[in-house]
């Protein structure tokens, strides 16, 4: 049956009606409205925006819209004691200081409350010492430094370029290497695309531009003081010394003009190869310390930021389902920004606003979705996904029983080349089918489907004629829903051409130059890419909330499980002798994957053939689909990461942004050749294989015939 029949309403209230109601001009207007002043988490301005969104969502027609508040640990610079880095001479005099703020963009010179660049949650401190250049500060960069080059970072201040991996992983790696401080900078090689002008004349990063960002290693904990539980008025709070994920050494970000001054004097070892050299006119020597003439000069950090418990506000809107009000489809994105949030997050928030408006319009005409749709405007995402995580902690019992799907809605664009989707395999077919019905906004693809342009520009590496869909990692608000609670999740946005633009993120990410004008002048003047993203996100929500049978295909999970099993087996097989010595076998895992494949195939046949008019049977089959993602959750969590509980996917231990498959096995195998006790190490591999095997088999059995 069609979704319109399911909710017993007029046929005009269908997906097409919902999509036709979405307007690019409205998204443009909403983006402009959301980006005129900063909306930093914990500030009055962001509270006022929350109240505005609550009011507008009510006007749009939602059944209820509530603000939910939490008191969480946030971090701010000291207004009277600014953060900076100095080069000091042998007398301790400051002969060069890094900038105190970014030059404001044209038209914004008189805007107050622009937070200067800082690394959120950096401890206070004034370390001084020699500099060591550590490339991107990845795990492999420190391996190169310590193992191959025999360079010791202990007691040194390290300088690392942004890019490739989440900044929190860089700081963790530097701490483990014994560094006393970390300087993060944006190298033009990563944040300045050739042939494009700097803002305000183009979308490249100017030399004075700086990327803000948190440097936590929360591993899904949410508020550092209340891990596992909501940060409400009766919450027990840990002391700062016991807080989760806080860095232990001072950290500060700078732009490439300042980096030039620090790096140009570097001496010591030459960089190991070209992959360590950026685009500045400096030698990219590793150090430690400055070269001959400047060898008596040192670097000193002056960090005075404070961490304080601060109130944050989520906006939660409800559109009650007509048939299954106890089944929730959630569309959520954050509202807080570092400064103006032209792309992150307001290009996403504007799309959510327009999706709410369209759903509200249909509701005012008498329509209701089959299932309940929850809309969320999250706070404090930039400070560690705090708003979404606290809300999910507070509502975890409801969510684990009723949560059908979560669709994330942060930045709608990070480029204007093609679509980018990361999601659970359960949603692959939903995304393929939806994009085949949507029109491509791309030049040269007029009259063609989005699926066609996406497939052409971003082909699947495995299956010809299909587009690439990536694994979910983290670094955004879907984390708690997917990695902790096991709710099927997905995200979509327009992206750059990764072949030709190798810089990490978009150049102006988290800088003061992320303005409305950046989007309107350079990324999406017609707001056609925003509209397409609204159609994809909104279309997914519509189908998930309104399809009689949930649009999940468990056979796609079977396919990826086999692929992931092959991949982890091949990694392990790089150590054939040890596998033999310690009797390591993947046979059980492959057997479980085979069982899953067969059971999923049979389930799909039953799903095709069962009587859809039998409400009990329908609910039973839908519950099996809904709970399949939940079945991959291990209540004990991953080793040392209790809030990452999904056995098939977790954020990479080396890069929070990236997803890793069979993470328990992967981490057990990682760098295993360097472990001091190989017997224990391979024992852990075997334990992780058994956990994965059990989980895959148990998940398969949830799809078996009930009786």
């Amino acid at each position: 049956k069609s979704s319109s029949e399911a909710t017993n309403i007029t046929p005009k209230h269908n997906m097409k009606a919902f999509l036709d109601e979405l307007k690019a001009e409205n998204i443009k207007k909403f983006l402009h409205n959301f980006t005129q002043i900063p909306h930093l988490a914990g500030t009055e301005q962001n509270f006022q925006l929350a109240k505005q969104i609550q009011s507008q969502w009510k006007e749009f027609g939602l059944d209820s819209v509530e603000l939910t508040h939490y008191d969480v640990l946030l971090s701010y610079p000291n207004k009277t004691h600014p953060n900076y880095i100095s080069i000091i001479n042998e007398d301790g005099n400051e002969i060069f200081n890094t900038s105190l703020f970014e030059p404001p963009p044209a038209g914004y010179e008189n805007v107050s409350d622009i937070v200067p660049p800082f690394s959120a949650f950096s401890p206070q401190g004034m370390p001084e010492g020699d500099l060591v250049y550590v490339n991107y500060a990845r795990t492999e960069d420190f391996f190169k430094l310590e193992r191959d080059m025999k360079i010791n970072c202990s007691g040194k201040i390290v300088i690392a370029r942004y890019g490739k991996v989440f900044r929190g992983n860089k700081v963790k790696n530097a701490q483990l290497a014994g560094a006393t401080g970390v300087i993060l900078y944006s190298d033009p090689a990563d944040y300045f695309a050739p042939g494009v002008k700097s803002y305000p004349d183009g979308w490249n990063l100017p030399g004075g531009g700086v990327q803000r960002g948190n440097i936590l290693n929360l591993n899904g904990a949410g508020d550092p003081l209340t891990p596992g539980y909501p940060a409400n008025e009766y919450a027990y709070r840990r002391g700062i010394a016991e807080a989760v994920g806080l860095p232990s050494i001072p950290v500060h970000p700078i732009g490439y003009y300042d980096a030039q001054k620090l790096l140009e004097k570097m001496g010591g070892s030459a960089s190991p190869d070209s992959s360590w050299r950026g685009s500045l006119k400096v030698p990219y020597n590793v150090g430690p310390g400055f070269t001959g003439n400047f060898s008596t000069q040192k670097v000193k950090m002056h960090i005075h930021s404070t961490s304080e418990v601060t109130r944050i506000y989520n906006v939660i809107g409800t559109l009650r389902g007509a048939v299954e009000p106890d089944r929730y489809v959630i569309l959520g994105g954050h509202r807080d920004s570092w400064v103006f949030g032209g792309i992150d997050p307001q290009s996403g928030a504007a799309v959510v606003h327009e999706i709410v408006r369209s759903f509200g319009t249909l509701k005012k005409e008498g329509w209701r979705p089959r299932r309940t749709i929850l809309f969320a405007s999250w706070d404090a995402e930039e400070f560690g996904l705090l708003g979404s995580t606290e809300w999910a902690e507070e509502n975890s019992r409801l969510l684990q029983e009723r949560g059908v799907a979560y669709i994330n809605a942060d930045s709608s664009i990070e480029g204007n080349y093609t679509l980018r989707v990361d999601c659970t395999p359960l949603m692959y077919s939903l995304v393929y089918n939806l994009t085949k019905e949507l029109e491509s906004p791309d030049e040269g693809f007029e009259g063609k489907s989005l699926y066609e342009s996406w497939t052409k520009k971003s082909p699947s590496p495995e299956f010809s004629g299909m587009p690439r869909i990536s694994k979910l990692g983290s670094g955004n608000d879907f984390e708690v829903f997917f990695q902790r609670l096991g709710i099927a999740s997905g995200r979509a946005r327009y992206t750059k051409n990764w072949e030709t633009n190798k810089f990490s993120s978009y150049p102006l990410y988290h800088s003061v130059y992320e303005t409305y004008e950046l989007v309107e002048k350079f990324y999406d003047p017609m707001f056609k890419y925003h509209l397409t993203v609204a159609q994809v996100r909104g279309g997914m929500v519509f189908e998930l909330a309104n399809s009689v049978v949930l649009p999940f295909d468990c056979r796609d999970y079977a396919v990826v499980l086999r692929k992931y099993a092959d991949k982890i087996y091949n990694i392990s097989m790089k150590h054939p002798q040890e596998m033999k010595t310690y009797s390591v076998s993947f046979d059980s895992l492959f057997s479980a994957v085979k069982n899953f494949t067969e059971i999923a195939s049979k389930f799909s046949e039953r799903l095709r053939d069962f009587d859809k008019s039998n409400p009990i049977l329908l609910r039973m089959m839908n519950d099996q689909l809904m709970f399949l993602e939940r079945a991959f959750i291990d209540p004990l969590g991953l080793p040392d990461r209790p809030f990452y509980r999904h056995v098939i996917y977790a954020p990479s231990s080396h890069n929070k942004y990236a997803g890793e498959s069979f993470p328990g096995i992967y981490d057990a195998l990682f760098d295993i050749e360097s472990k001091v006790d190989p017997s224990q190490a391979w024992g852990e591999v075997k334990r992780q294989i058994s956990i994965a095997t059990f989980t895959v088999q148990a998940a398969a059995e949830t799809l078996s015939e009930v009786a």
Partner: nanobody, 123 residues
Framework: EVQLVESGGGVVQPGRSLRLSCAAS????????MHWVRQAPGKGLEWVAF????????YYADSVKGRFTISRDNSKNTLYLQMNSLRDEDTALYYC????????????????WGQGTMVTVSS
């Protein structure tokens, strides 16, 4: 129209002080490093001082170090030069100039100049 207007010059005795001002219009001072440059009668241009857009760094010519202080009030779009312990050789036409690099961290080339204000140090 983008322009710089200097003021505060005059005749002063050696050892005394003077404060020059430079009012910027047509562009936001807050985004640019700013220079003071001088030209003594019959001589070439001499760079005097530079201050980064954010006030984090100040650079001075050796001839004025310890005597002159460059400062700015971005909210008033104005640059200043406080000149103490003036000497005969400080007699010159003083110009303020905008650094061409937005957000620059060290002195670079100038792209906009004022008309200058005359300072005469004489007993």
């Amino acid at each position: 129209e983008v322009q710089l207007v200097e003021s505060g010059g005059g005749v002063v005795q050696p050892g005394r002080s003077l404060r020059l001002s430079c009012a910027a219009s047509g562009f936001p001072l807050i985004s640019y490093g700013m220079h003071w440059v001088r030209q003594a009668p019959g001589k070439g241009l001499e760079w005097v001082a530079f201050m980064t857009y954010d006030g984090s760094n100040r650079y001075y010519a050796d001839s004025v170090k310890g005597r002159f202080t460059i400062s700015r009030d971005n909210s008033k779009n104005t640059l200043y030069l406080q000149m103490n312990s003036l000497r005969d050789e400080d007699t010159a036409l003083y110009y303020c100039a905008r650094d061409r690099i937005v957000g620059g961290r060290v002195p670079d080339a100038f792209d906009i100049w004022g008309q200058g204000t005359m300072v005469t140090v004489s007993s």
